[in-house]
């Protein structure tokens, strides 16, 4: 259900690797975009 937007991710980053480094504001933005699925906060309904 999660779409991986490869153009926004570097070096085949995974959800786990992103969530492990949620420190900077840019990390959060990348995370929310990664989770886009059906919405910015993530996941299909």
């Amino acid at each position: 259900k999660h779409k991986c937007f490869r153009n926004s991710l570097e070096n085949n980053e995974t959800l786990e690797s992103i969530m492990n480094t949620l420190e900077s504001e840019e990390d959060f933005r990348k995370y929310f975009y990664y989770l886009e699925g059906s919405k910015g906060g993530g996941g299909s309904k």
């Epitope: 969530m19 492990n20 933005r29 975009y33 989770l35």
Partner: antibody, heavy 114, light 113 residues
């Protein structure tokens, strides 16, 4: 379907603490974080902070630093928000929400009164 | 912190007419890496939690009537209700999730004229 179910209303005295729970279902709990947002009577929405259900990392609003603690229990897919040293102006409806706010709990009224 | 300022504070619109709510952020919420605006709109009715209407500034949430639309980019955003219905009476909030703390506008109350 995604659901966030919160604990019931609380009445507390000034100086006391309150702990509100938020049980999540319908999604992979550890893939998301939980925000807490409060709303004083007749007022707008105030973001209190966020916790990662993946590793427990937190990001608190500066105004509440030192008084608020957010935790999660992945075994029960439940998030908790504890607020200490309660004051009358902490009287509000407290909401949990997934990440920045795509799904919300029903709210928990916390009344602080002597 | 990013300040979110909504206008007007309240709005009275006749049934079937257009309602327009503006939201201005104190700094841009457009992320250049993905060209997304980290801006959401919510509807809140008395005694209920906020309900997500719009995210990414212009993407309508599943199940939200198409009379609701969002537009704008950078610092200036608009929520439009193209034809106001009785059930649309509520308070509407914008929120940025570009930078913590994720802040909300002060709210706009929409009523029937």
């Amino acid at each position: 379907q995604v659901q966030l179910v919160q604990s019931g209303a609380e009445v507390k005295k000034p100086g006391a603490s309150v702990k509100v729970s938020c049980k999540a279902s319908g999604y992979t709990f550890t893939s998301y974080g939980v925000s807490w947002v409060r709303q004083a009577p007749g007022q707008g929405l105030e973001w209190m902070g966020w916790i990662s259900a993946y590793n427990g990392n937190t990001n608190y609003a500066q105004k509440l630093q030192g008084r608020v603690t957010m935790t999660t229990d992945t075994s029960t897919s439940t998030a908790y928000m504890e607020l200490t040293s309660l004051r009358s102006d902490d009287t509000a409806v407290y909401y949990c929400a997934r990440n920045w706010g795509d799904y919300w709990g029903q709210g928990t009224l916390v009344t602080v009164s002597s | 912190d990013i300040q979110m300022t909504q206008s007007p504070d309240s709005l009275a619109v006749s049934l079937g007419e257009r309602a327009t709510i503006n939201c201005k952020s104190s700094q841009s919420v457009l992320y250049s890496s993905n060209n997304k605006n980290y801006l959401a709109w919510y509807q809140q009715k008395p005694g209920q939690p906020p309900k997500l209407l719009i995210y990414w500034a212009s993407t309508r949430e599943s199940g939200v009537p198409d009379r609701f639309s969002g537009s704008g980019s950078g610092t200036d955003f608009t929520l439009t209700i193209s034809s106001l219905q009785a059930e649309d009476v509520a308070v509407y909030y914008c929120q940025q999730y570009y930078s913590t703390p994720w802040t909300f506008g002060q709210g706009t109350k929409v009523e029937i004229k």
